[in-house]
Interface confidence: low
């Protein structure tokens, strides 16, 4: 189905306008900001979601990187250019003609330049490390229970194939979820790890993108899992290209 038929809403994206515009009066939903039709049976791409949210502020984040080539989204929110399939265009520019290259999750991977900057291809982010710190609990969570619950969450809520959840690490109070998805592994119809990570990030912040659902109520064996900090690292198939001055 394209969207909920009964009341014509988009279950997977509340940042849409829906009406019975489709063939045979079927409900069709378009993303705010871009006006692009979205498939409400799956997650909307991060690019279209960012475009819809372009006016909302977002805190910048910095921490020590877990690897030499890992990227953190320090630039915050911007109004992205998306291709006709809703993916980020490799080159992004702002209103003042400052341009930069991004990866498949829309995170800057080069120094900023001018309109002459070329970004030959959209480099795929194939490994995402979601680093969470949970609030103090009476005791540590059971690792295997935590692992099972987070895998279930990604499978059922975000429709991410279980094979893309590579690992769940736990050292109280830190939880790390590893998502891995190479270009060759991603089949047509598979949810992108970048989109799943973005939906999860928004859920964790209490800003769910799902229509009409309550916020994320994450429990491990009945015990609430409340996250107090989230940090997401992105690793690309090709290392980013930053000048040395940025690394000092």
């Amino acid at each position: 189905h394209t969207a909920a038929q009964d009341n014509c809403t988009c279950p997977t994206n509340k940042m849409t306008v829906c009406s019975p515009d489709g063939p045979g009066g079927r409900c069709q939903c378009r993303a705010l900001g871009s006006g692009m039709a979205v498939d409400c049976s799956t997650l909307t791409s991060k690019c279209l979601l960012l475009k819809a949210r372009m006016s909302a502020p977002k805190n910048a984040r910095t921490l020590v990187r877990p690897s030499e080539h890992a990227l953190v989204d320090n630039d915050g929110l911007y109004d992205p250019d998306c291709d006709p399939e809703g993916r980020f265009k490799a080159r992004q520019c702002n209103q003042t003609s400052v341009c930069w290259c991004v990866n498949s999750v829309g995170v800057r991977r080069t120094d900023k330049g001018d309109l002459s900057l070329r970004c030959d291809e959209l480099v795929r982010t194939h490994h995402i490390l979601i680093d969470l710190r949970h609030r103090p609990t009476a005791g540590a969570f059971n690792h295997s229970d935590l692992d099972a619950e987070l895998r279930r969450l990604f499978r059922e809520r975000y429709r991410l194939h279980p094979k893309f959840v590579a690992a769940v690490h736990y050292e109280q109070p830190t939880i790390q979820i590893e998502l891995r998805q190479n270009t060759s592994q991603k089949a047509a119809g598979d949810v992108d790890i970048g989109d799943a990570a973005y939906y999860f990030e928004r859920d964790i912040k209490g800003e769910s993108l799902f229509q009409g659902r309550g916020g994320l109520d994450l429990r491990v064996r009945g015990e609430p899992l409340q996250v107090e900090r989230t940090l997401i690292y992105y690793l690309d198939e090709i290392p980013p290209k930053f000048s040395m001055k940025r690394l000092t």
Epitope: R30, D83, K89
Partner: antibody
Framework: QVQLVQSGAEVKKPGASVKVSCKAS????????MQWVRQAPGQGLEWMGW????????KYAEDFKGRVTISLDTSTSTAYLQLSSLKSEDTAVYYC??????????????WGQGTLVTVSS | DIQMTQSPSSLSASVGDRVTITCKAS??????VAWYQQKPGKAPKLLIY???YRYTGVPSRFSGSGSGTDFTLTISSLQPEDFAVYYC?????????FGQGTKLEIK
């Protein structure tokens, strides 16, 4: 089905103004941009400007700035093009066309039938 | 402004022929080029957008390619209903600009 229906042909004198309407149906008006393009007899297509129906903000081609106004009535899903200080060179078929909001989507997937505006003394 | 130069300006061909129309942008427009077909007295119809994406309902004999400054519309096997004027348009940056058109006539 999705369609754009434009107002009828107009004959105007030089110096006068004309207002062409474009009524949208079959889709949610505020989820797509509305563009205006004109075509002089036997000539090619010329972009005049567009309006973001979500924000109501118009943008005009430099050649028409000061003479053109693009506006909306979202309650009736109608866009308007007003052109003032008409000259004989403004004789053309004026089209409204639907597009997306961002540069990736500034192609025109649905067109109105066109409104012939003739400027003659 | 970005100029879009189409070639040829007119073309004679027969049913069944393979036809190619080219469009050259005066500066890099990435893949933001659309192609339209227009018949006499009618509004243009969208065929291709973003250089290579065929619009809904457009027959598979129409295809588009190119990036940067050079773009091509190909009709693999001409049908009688394909004789019309074809326009390219860049949708990279405003002002949006069109090519001058290519008139495809029956030989």
């Amino acid at each position: 089905q999705v369609q754009l229906v434009q107002s009828g042909a107009e004959v105007k004198k030089p110096g006068a103004s004309v207002k062409v309407s474009c009524k949208a149906s079959g889709y949610t008006f505020t989820t797509a941009g509305m563009q205006w393009v004109r075509q002089a007899p036997g000539q090619g297509l010329e972009w005049m400007g567009w309006i973001n129906t979500h924000s109501g903000v118009p943008k005009y081609a430099e050649d028409f700035k000061g003479r053109v106004t693009i506006s909306l009535d979202t309650s009736t899903s109608t866009a308007y093009l007003q052109l003032s200080s008409l000259k004989s060179e403004d004789t053309a078929v004026y089209y409204c066309a639907r597009s997306g909001f961002g540069s990736s989507y500034w192609y025109f997937d649905v067109w109105g039938q066109g409104t012939l505006v003739t400027v003659s003394s | 402004d970005i100029q879009m130069t189409q070639s040829p300006s007119s073309l004679s061909a027969s049913v069944g022929d393979r036809v190619t129309i080219t469009c050259k942008a005066s500066q890099d427009v990435s893949t933001a080029v659309a192609w339209y077909q227009q018949k006499p007295g009618k509004a243009p119809k969208l065929l291709i957008y973003s250089a290579s994406y065929r619009y809904t309902g457009v027959p598979s004999r129409f295809s588009g390619s190119g990036s940067g400054t050079d773009f091509t519309l190909t009709i693999s096997s001409l049908q009688p209903e394909d004789f019309a004027v074809y326009y390219c348009q860049q949708h990279y940056i405003t002002p949006l600009t069109f090519g001058q058109g290519t008139k495809l006539e029956i030989k």
